[in-house]
């Protein structure tokens, strides 16, 4: 009699994550009597995937009715494939007995799963840095397969070169992750700047996935201070202005000191934005010269975004 053959026609099958995979298997003979089982992997550690007689395999269904008389098709369909389903699947014929005895295995079908990378997530530094300092941004994307992937960084459309990228794991895996760090030199003009992490993969339909971060979250632009005196008014009052310019973020407290004593404290709020994203603020102080015998030392003290205070002083001359 002709020897029983277990035929798995496809050496390999590739599917997209989320789709269904059909693994084909036919036998050449109905005898000897005994069940067919599907396993992933070979040897003692193999994993039972489908057994018609018993067990609960919610994602696996038989393609044709295995209980039908003279059925020789034992193909299965696995639904909602994930990268974790990748591996080699074997259709195995058993001879009925107590227990059943393994008789013949098919050659195996390798299931390969292609999975899209997750949307890249870009994170910036935990604390703000000032212009002319370098800050690091990190981009992460997960769950893709195959391993080949390209990641590029851009700042305002220009590709960055100070980049370090790793794809993990280094060896064979069902899916992979990428992590990249870009070092960005900040300038005073970067409040409106943006960094983009762009990930391209074979599973994406020509359009890379993008993650973005705004440099406004990472930068601090310290203010310039200028104290000036307006001309003396007829009522012996002098108007002194403190101009605080080109600062970011808006969080700023200004204190006037007269001869070292606090005269007034103000908080910046609802300021109009400059074209470059920075802010300007002007504060005025009226000084009654006739109330002073000596020159008055006025100090404009600015505390910006929790940083140490910056002072600018000015002396108002009191003529004898």
């Amino acid at each position: 009699e002709e020897e029983l053959q277990v035929i798995q026609p496809e050496k390999s099958v590739s599917v997209a994550a989320g789709d269904s995979a059909t693994l084909n298997c036919t036998v050449s003979s109905l005898i000897p009597v005994g069940p067919i089982q599907w396993f992933r992997g070979a040897g003692p550690g193999r994993e039972l995937i489908y057994n018609l007689k018993e067990g609960h395999f919610p994602r696996v269904t038989a393609v044709s009715d295995p209980t039908k008389r003279n059925n020789m098709d034992f193909s299965i369909r696995i639904s909602n494939i994930t990268p974790a389903d990748a591996g080699t699947y074997y259709c195995v014929k058993f001879r009925k007995g107590s227990p059943d005895v393994e008789l013949k295995s098919g050659a195996g079908t390798e299931l390969s799963v292609r999975a899209k990378p997750s949307a890249p997530v870009v994170s910036g530094p935990a604390v703000r840095a000032t212009a002319e300092h370098t800050v690091s941004f990190t981009c992460e994307s997960h769950g893709f397969s195959p391993r080949d992937i390209t990641l590029k960084w851009f700042k305002n459309g220009n590709e960055l070169s100070d980049v370090q990228t790793n794809v993990d794991p280094a060896g064979k895996s069902v899916s992979y992750s990428i992590r990249s760090t870009a070092r960005v030199l900040l300038t005073r003009r970067d409040v409106h700047s943006q960094v983009i992490c762009e990930v391209a993969h074979v599973t994406l339909q020509g359009d890379p996935l993008r993650g973005t971060a705004n440099l406004s979250e990472a930068i601090r632009v310290p203010p310039f201070l200028e104290v000036t005196q307006q001309s003396m008014r007829a009522d012996n009052q002098v108007n002194v202005t403190c101009q605080v310019t080109k600062f970011y973020p808006q969080r700023l407290q200004l204190t006037w000191l007269e001869n070292g004593n606090v005269s007034r404290t103000e908080m910046a709020s609802a300021l109009p934005e400059n074209k470059d994203g920075t802010y300007n603020w002007t504060s005025w102080l009226l000084v009654n010269v006739s109330a002073h015998r000596d020159d008055v030392k006025l100090t404009c003290q600015v505390e910006h975004d929790g940083q140490p205070a910056v002072n600018k002083s000015f002396s108002v001359k009191v003529s004898a």
Epitope: S12, P146, A200, V202, T203, Q205, G206
Partner: antibody, heavy 116, light 109 residues
Framework: QSVEESGGRLGQPGTPLTLSCTVS????????MGWFRQAPGKGLEYIGI?????SPYYASWVNGRFTISKTSTTMDLKMNSLRSEDTATYFC?????????????WGPGTLVTVSS | DIQMTQSPSSLSASVGDRVTITCRAS??????LAWYQQKPGKAPKLLIY???FLYSGVPSRFSGSGSGTDFTLTISSLQPEDFATYYC???????????FGQGTKVEIK
């Protein structure tokens, strides 16, 4: 699911020509589409692709001579200034459902002949 | 740009023969290689993708192997309808560009 090219004809050197690719059974907004050509008796040559969102990418030799664009149902290849070496059958094709590394649906082709 | 070198450029074989066509890439393309069959006056037809995966509806006598730079298309038992020209096509995941081999014409001996 199918694709079909149109617009191929006899054209004079230096004149423009636009070829179209009409798709049915799937959406152009879901797949990368490509243009290829084959000169008489020669092999296949890649021209360029357009991404699902409409971004075109070209083979390095194209050098601005061709422009790929699309509407909701058609993809176009604009040949800015025909040359005699552009005489070929032009094919459009769609990438496979698993990724952009292969093309599984091809049109029958449209013939462009450039001659004065 | 990546160059794809296909060999032989043509071959003569008989029905039932085992036929092997090779394709070599000028740099690694991992497994991003497809094989197409084209008959005169017709569009190419996809046979194999990802170097070794048989496209649906393609007879199992066609098989592909290889990765990196060296790839092979094998027809285990040549049938009358298999006389055609075969092309390999690469995709490079960094440049995201495609290149074809120059083709192999399989003729009747």
């Amino acid at each position: 699911q199918s694709v079909e090219e149109s617009g191929g004809r006899l054209g004079q050197p230096g004149t423009p020509l636009t070829l179209s690719c009409t798709v049915s059974g799937f959406s152009l907004s879901s797949y990368v589409m490509g243009w290829f050509r084959q000169a008489p008796g020669k092999g296949l040559e890649y021209i360029g692709i357009i991404s699902s969102s409409g971004s075109p990418y070209y083979a390095s030799w194209v050098n601005g001579r061709f422009t790929i664009s699309k509407t909701s149902t058609t993809m176009d290849l604009k040949m800015n200034s025909l040359r005699s070496e552009d005489t070929a059958t032009y094919f459009c094709a769609r990438v496979g459902p698993l990724g952009v590394d292969y093309f599984n649906i091809w049109g029958p082709g449209t013939l462009v002949t450039v001659s004065s | 740009d990546i160059q794809m070198t296909q060999s032989p450029s043509s071959l003569s074989a008989s029905v039932g023969d085992r036929v092997t066509i090779t394709c070599r890439a000028s740099q690694s393309i991992n497994s991003y290689l497809a094989w197409y069959q084209q008959k005169p006056g017709k569009a190419p037809k996809l046979l194999i993708y990802s170097a070794s995966f048989l496209y649906s509806g393609v007879p199992s006598r066609f098989s592909g192997s290889g990765s990196g730079t060296d790839f092979t298309l094998t027809i285990s038992s040549l049938q009358p309808e298999d006389f055609a020209t075969y092309y390999c096509q690469s995709w490079h995941y960094i440049s995201r560009s495609y290149t074809f081999g120059q083709g192999t014409k399989v003729e009747i001996k």
